[in-house]
Interface confidence: low
Amino acid sequence: WPPPGTGDVVVQAPTQVPGFLGDSVTLPCYLQVPNMEVTHVSQLTWARHGESGSMAVFHQTQGPSYSESKRLEFVAARLGAELRNASLRMFGLRVEDEGNYTCLFVTFPQGSRSVDIWLRVLAKPQNTAEVQKVQLTGEPVPMARCVSTGGRPPAQITWHSDLGGMPNTSQVPGFLSGTVTVTSLWILVPSSQVDGKNVTCKVEHESFEKPQLLTVNLTVYYPPEVSISGYDNNWYLGQNEATLTCDARSNPEPTGYNWSTTMGPLPPFAVAQGAQLLIRPVDKPINTTLICNVTNALGARQAELTVQVKEGPPSEHSGISRN
């Protein structure tokens, strides 16, 4: 039986403590002594399950001793003070530090009291997202890449987009032992409509307060898509100048515009001004098919427009821009 008056002297500690790879962590451990209880602590000891010997000892007269003096430190224990706080700080946390530790108080008259603590080693991943610049392929290709490097446990990567697309996610061991690098490719059939749009990579990890969102601006290289605007089918003799515009979307930007007709060069009443074509007043009806040919680094594309200038009053129908 224990001596008279001996109550519940217990060691208090969390069952699990998280710590970050490379950082320091404190394993908290306290001796809880009831009010009327008397206890004398002569030693504090830390040991790791599965390893022989102790990793840290605080002796009543000798002070602290460590198996790895540069990596361990008693936080509060001091010579000449009551040994009630055995909390141990570990520096430069490694993956192999993960495991079960026993914190033990050598007391009198209660004897030894101990508790087990599970140290969980986490690694906060570094996250990057980058565009994979592509051309029109007609088949699904990676258009964005999101990498969460060196997480422990592995980060969760999801993609958010109204463009559709399919993720392709893989994992490899991280450079630091026990960590994982997660790579997620966002795969879609490239189209001109996708160029310049955004997709968002969402990275979730238990080390983050909130998910990290990384936006990728997609790049699709494509030849020009061409149309001609400015004609409303209501052009009449005697009206003022009108302007047609060659509207081109492309990536990279157009490098040249060339105006012609199906019959060859432009007639005298049509004057090319880059992407615009000035149509001067004419004195007789015309029916001409105009061609705008647009070039960029990937090729050339054209659009055609048949323009008619008819007899009749340029009354309220007129769609020509007047000077």
């Epitope: 490379g22 990498v147 893989s170 061991p173 450079f175 630091l176």
Partner: antibody, heavy 116, light 107 residues
Framework: EVQLVQSGSELKKPGASVKVSCKTS????????MHWVRQPHGKGLEWIGG????????SYNQRFKGRVTITVDKSTSTAYMELSSLRSEDTAVYYC?????????WGQGTLVTVSS | DIQMTQSPSAMSASVGDRVTITCKAS??????VAWYQQKPGQPPKALIY???YRYSGVPDRFSGSGSGTDFTLTISSLQAEDLAEYFC?????????FGQGTKLEIK
């Protein structure tokens, strides 16, 4: 533009040491692991080891353990690889390479010749 | 260590030919394989990552396939500038290992 620029060729005697540098630019040095790979003339590639610039943690190929030391100088974004106790079979082109799972950028290579 | 065995060690082909290089891993490496092209006097250049995805800027005549232990690099229509040595590499586990290389010559 990512660039890895290595130091010049070295001629060493057996038993000596060599230290090769790799100065980087165009990216954040501490965000990527730097590795070293060597290639004897006309032969294949052999991974030597690597270092994480942030924490200085290293990983080495056991074949070179004890003879190789990889370090970094964060202030100049430079990685170093030192190989000691050189022997003739260490004659090779030594490359630094940035790691992204695979090696996406390589230095131009440094020829180390070991000859008496 | 994981061995990466490449074949053939050397080959000759004509412009326009379809060329296939294989790489066999001594144990499962998933899809954690990269392919590199090395031209004479130059460092290696990454072509393929994760076994089958081309790096941006790499011509689409280059393609990779495979998973587990068997991997292939294919050049669909050989060009004169493809004269080089090609290497596979596993990055599933340390130490990273490379194939011994395939020297490709143009007939």
């Amino acid at each position: 533009e990512v660039q890895l620029v290595q130091s010049g060729s070295e001629l060493k005697k057996p038993g000596a040491s060599v230290k090769v540098s790799c100065k980087t630019s165009g990216y954040t040095f501490t965000e990527y692991t730097m590795h070293w790979v060597r290639q004897p003339h006309g032969k294949g590639l052999e991974w030597i080891g690597g270092i994480h610039p942030n924490q200085g943690e290293t990983s080495y190929n056991q074949r070179f353990k004890g003879r190789v030391t990889i370090t970094v100088d964060k202030s100049t974004s430079t990685a170093y690889m030192e190989l000691s106790s050189l022997r003739s079979e260490d004659t090779a082109v030594y490359y630094c390479a940035r790691w992204t799972g695979d090696f996406d950028y390589w230095g131009q290579g440094t020829l180390v010749t070991v000859s008496s | 260590d994981i061995q990466m065995t490449q074949s053939p060690s050397a080959m000759s082909a004509s412009v326009g030919d379809r060329v296939t290089i294989t790489c066999k891993a001594s144990q499962n490496v998933g899809t954690n394989v990269a392919w590199y092209q090395q031209k004479p006097g130059q460092p290696p250049k990454a072509l393929i990552y994760s076994a089958s995805y081309r790096y941006s800027g790499v011509p689409d005549r280059f393609s990779g396939s495979g998973s587990g232990t068997d991997f292939t690099l294919t050049i669909s229509s050989l060009q004169a500038e493809d004269l080089a040595e090609y290497f596979c590499q596993q990055y599933q586990s340390y130490p990273y290992t490379f194939g011994q290389g395939t020297k490709l010559e143009i007939k």
